[in-house]
């Protein structure tokens, strides 16, 4: 059997063989473009392409939509893995999304989506999900029905005061909405009462600015 | 629509406790904070605080700490104010107004006159 | 704190003016400021949010401006219902801060 030498996700990476956590090199579908990924091949069964994570605030999140669209930061430390990217995997088949997010007394939750998918760039990148479940809250933080995704260069969201200049970060913002992962980066006893940090207002509620986070996505019949 | 509801007006003497409550209606309670802003006669806006309705956990502007409670019922989409051993100083038109994502006082309660005298 | 000053504490113009209120603030605030209006029977209202975004509802007479230390709100058509005292407030830092109050009268 000839052995798969291109990869379009974590998942076929661990299915490969290749089982352990690190950075790897995926393929756009129906492309030879290629992009580099972080994969925890670790929580829940492994597999997982991690889309987002912040972890101390070293990256610039208050980006442009250009680079929200390419992805940006180190795949070993906080970055973006890219909207485009993000849109044409998740048109191809069926994926969840998994939220994985820290505080800053030690405590962890989740949210798991069972249904993920982006728009094209022509629907702003906009966010569909279905099917919650996990402990970061009973209702998802993240607007339903989806919004579309608004940088400080690209207003689109349901607000007149422009969300992602005000409360820093691309996003799928409402008028504001619930959350904001791509927030202001708050340290330790700098993390209450900010209105524009990492959000998750389901887990946390309003103002609490979060230690880490990390998005993820996987194939449903994984 | 929304719309915040506040007790009726108050008078205490010094050294009494006084409770004040703000009913929500129109909008889901715990989705939204709530402000609680003081107006001295004759004077201007002086934020309080504010409480968590979703963690029930409150913040206390400094010169409110120690003698001022924020407090929910969650059941009853109710914020309350509590000052304890009332003083003179704290004669006054106390307002609540509903948090928006931290930024912004949106709708605001008819306010709540406290007269504090012996 | 943040210290927000409104150095016209009360103002008299006609119905129909163009009215400006000012105020400035002790430190750079990156254009987290609003606008409320407090009427004569105490109800009181935000009109402006985030220096120039207009609340739900609210005439579009008004409107906000500014940035640093320096904002204003101006009121473009001056109606009746306009008597009121209007205040700023920020959110940069807390505690929230508002300003001192601008009472706005008919000539």
């Known amino acids: 059997k000839e052995e798969q030498t291109t990869f379009r996700d974590c998942a076929e990476i661990f299915k490969s063989g290749l089982t352990t956590s690190g950075i790897y090199t995926l393929t756009f579908p129906n492309s030879t473009e290629e992009i580099k990924a972080y994969c925890d091949m670790d929580v829940g069964g492994g597999g997982w392409t991690v889309i987002q994570h912040r972890e101390d605030g070293s990256v610039d999140f208050q980006r442009t939509w250009k680079e929200y669209k390419e992805g940006f930061g180190s795949p070993l430390g906080e970055y973006w893995l890219g909207n485009e990217f993000v849109s044409q995997l998740t048109g191809q088949h069926r994926y969840v999304l998994k939220i994985q997010l820290k505080d800053w007394e030690g405590n962890e939750a989740h949210s798991l989506y069972d249904h993920f998918y982006l728009a094209g760039e022509e629907s702003n990148y906009r966010i569909h999900l279905t099917g919650l479940t996990g402990t970061a809250g009973k209702i998802s933080s993240i607007s339903q029905p989806g919004s579309d995704f608004s940088t400080k260069d690209s207003d689109n969201d349901k607000c007149i005061c422009k969300c992602s200049q005000m409360l820093s970060g691309g996003w799928w913002f409402d008028a504001c909405g619930p959350s904001n992962l791509n927030g202001q980066y708050y340290p330790q006893k700098q993390n209450t009462n900010k209105f524009n940090g990492i959000k998750w207002y389901y887990w946390k509620g309003s103002g609490y600015s979060l230690k880490a986070t990390t998005m993820m996505i996987r194939p449903a019949d994984f | 629509q929304i719309q915040l509801v506040q007790s009726g007006p108050e008078l205490k003497k010094p050294g009494e406790t006084v409770k004040i409550s703000c009913k929500a209606s129109?909008?889901?309670?715990?989705?939204?904070?709530m402000n609680w802003v003081k107006q001295a006669p004759g004077k201007g806006l002086k934020w309080m605080g504010w409480?968590?309705?979703?963690?029930?956990?409150?913040t206390y502007a400094d010169d409110f700490k120690g003698r001022f409670a924020f407090s929910l019922e969650t059941s009853a989409s109710t914020a309350y104010l509590q000052i304890n051993n009332l003083k003179n100083e704290d004669t006054a038109t106390y307002f609540c107004?509903?948090?928006?994502?931290?930024?912004?006082?949106?709708?605001w309660g008819q306010g709540t006159s406290v007269t504090v005298s012996s | 704190d943040i210290q927000m000053t409104q150095t016209t504490s009360s103002l008299s113009a006609s119905l129909g003016d163009r009215v400006t209120i000012s105020c400035s603030t002790s430190q750079g605030i990156s254009n987290y400021l609003n606008w409320y209006q407090q009427k004569p029977d105490g109800t009181v209202k935000l009109l402006i949010f985030?220096?120039?975004s207009l609340h739900s509802g609210v005439p579009s007479r008004f409107s906000g401006s500014g940035s640093g230390t320096d904002y204003s709100l101006t009121i473009s058509n001056l109606e009746p219902e306009d008597i009121a005292t209007y205040y700023c407030q920020q959110y940069s830092k807390l505690p929230y801060t508002f300003g001192g109050g601008t009472k706005l009268e008919i000539k």
């Open positions: 409480i968590n309705t979703y963690t029930g956990e409150p």
């Open positions: 107004a509903r948090d928006h994502d931290g930024y912004l006082m949106d709708y």
């Open positions: 985030y220096t120039s």
């Open positions: 129109g909008y889901t309670f715990t989705n939204y904070g």
